[in-house]
């Protein structure tokens, strides 16, 4: 980019309502002008949740986002929301690129910038750009949760970030599930944390001028074993028309490996229950949780005989859980019935 160039998204036309998240790299010192919506009805620009004022070095004005000269602290997430609603018209992240200087490629990058160059930016040791986002120092979570540590920083040259766990370099290679390092967001993400993840996590942010660090504490509560948990309301009572297809859904949560069965309640010799007090059932489907689509029972081309009570039964080494639902099968649609009840199938 030439020093005089601006970053522009598009002219201020009516926006698409399906804005994809974008990332734009902007050189230090570069002017920025982004548009969102028509000029007279332009959206409101927000940076990191705070609405931009119509005046100032960084301003949101008549649908435009204008930055006279991009600085490291201008990096971050910008949203444009439609006036009078929360519809996102633009969702983008501005990332600090190299500064706009006339230096040669072979010049020592640490050398002093020419102060007469209006686009130069003095070298600066790393600093925290959003310390308020780092206030939650202790993260105490149950096992299975996702944990995200952030150390948003800036500096010139743009600093690098690395992570330590309990004082040792941390790349997550020994961690089941690994880690996600999102350098543009200055973050470390660990999914499905386990007790062995507990410890002190240090972000170390460095550039040629200096370094800063910050410590987070992570405690992980081991889950006590329990029988499977079934999501409330599933499977759901369902009404279908003869000849249609039906899906019954059962959502199972279990730390220990669960085993799932789909049962249909049946009648034998006019009775629904045996002498032992347990209902008569027919096993329709059985599998472990990792089998594909075990949590869904498909009933194709249903007939009146398919009507009745269905149970999702889940068990693990600790115990059993089950929930039931009723399938009602209506005769084939006739014009009168359709007019009275336009929805042929519904879920209670």
């Amino acid at each position: 980019l030439e020093a005089s160039e601006e970053v522009e998204l598009e002219p201020c036309l009516a926006p698409s309502l399906e804005q994809q998240e974008q990332e734009l790299t902007v050189a230090l010192g570069q002017p920025v002008r982004l548009c969102c919506g028509r000029a007279e009805r332009g959206g409101h620009w927000y940076k990191e949740g705070s609405r931009l004022a119509p005046a100032g070095r960084v301003r949101g004005w008549r649908g435009r986002l204008e930055i006279a000269s991009f600085l490291p602290e201008d990096a971050g997430r910008y949203l444009c929301l439609a006036r009078g609603s929360m519809i996102v018209l633009q969702n983008l992240t501005l990332i600090t690129g190299d500064s706009l200087t006339s230096s040669n490629d072979d010049e020592d990058p640490k050398s002093h910038r020419d102060p007469s160059n209006r686009h130069s930016y003095p070298q600066q040791a790393p600093y925290w750009t959003h310390p308020q986002r780092m206030e939650k120092k202790l993260h105490a979570v149950p096992a299975g949760n996702t944990v995200k540590f952030r150390c948003p920083a800036a500096g010139n040259p743009t600093p690098t970030i690395r992570w330590l766990k309990d004082g040792q370099a941390f790349h997550g290679e020994n961690r089941i599930g690994g880690i996600r390092l999102r350098h543009q967001h200055w973050s470390l993400v660990m999914e499905s944390v386990v007790p062995s993840d507990r410890g002190t996590y240090t972000c170390l942010v460095e550039n040629a001028v200096g370094s800063i660090r910050y410590n987070y504490l992570l405690d992980v509560l081991e889950r006590s074993p329990h029988r499977p948990i079934l999501q409330a309301g599933l499977p759901a009572n369902t009404t279908a028309v003869v000849g249609s297809d039906v899906e019954l859904l059962c959502k199972v949560y279990s730390d220990a490996q669960p085993h799932i069965q789909w049962l249909k309640h049946i009648v034998i010799n006019g009775s629904s229950f045996g002498a032992d007090g347990f209902p008569y059932v027919q096993v329709l489907k059985t599998a472990d949780i990792n089998s594909s689509e075990v949590e869904v029972l498909y009933l194709r081309n249903v007939s009146a005989e398919d009507a009745g009570e269905y149970t999702c039964l889940a068990g693990n080494s600790i115990g059993l859980s089950y929930q039931s639902a009723w399938l009602t099968v209506l005769p084939e649609e006739d014009p009168t019935w359709t007019a009275a009840a336009p929805e042929a199938r519904y879920t209670d």
């Epitope: 202790l138 309990d166 004082g167 410890g199 660090r213 410590n215 405690d219 081991e222």
Partner: antibody
Amino acid sequence: EVQLVESGGGLVQPGGSLRLSCAASGYTFTNHWMNWVRQAPGKGLEWVGMILPVDSETTLEQKFKDRFTISADTSKNTAYLQMNSLRAEDTAVYYCTRGDISLFDYWGQGTLVTVSS
Amino acid sequence: DIQMTQSPSSLSASVGDRVTITCRTSQDISNFLNWYQQKPGKAFKILISYTSRLHSGVPSRFSGSGSGTDFTLTISSLQPEDFATYYCQQGNALPYTFGQGTKVEIK
């Protein structure tokens, strides 16, 4: 065997200063958080703050931030609590305790600080 | 800050008695609750972490239970060496906070 030994307590006048020491042994001092907890006479326990000796990052309870500072000397395996502008209500037994993330697994015997004229 | 309310503040019991101490927090702390024992002239000792996990060397007559905001420390059969003061502490958020303590005395 992990041992924590506090020292430096005593009688000090209101407005005065005092520096408490906590000598640690029996474990790797640098990578465990060291906490200070105090107990006023007849009262419960109150967390003062903590330090990670490896980089001397400290976190202090809000009410102590303007008067107390925590530091550590890794060459001596010792943590310090510097208390300035002391008040009568700072009279307490001060304990250092090793932090294991969200709990305190080892404690010193405590050192008594009395602020009185 | 998370407030801790411990009760009773003191109790008298005899050897062999079952003793229960409760701790209530001002907000949900999941199971990040620890119990400590303080004896005169001795250092504090951690008894239970994460609501119910007994620390090594702690007798099995000590047990902990609860979740969310209500927690209990139980001594199933009080022994002479158990006469002491007990404190709960939350480890869910900074600043760490403690209960006011429960002194268990000989009846």
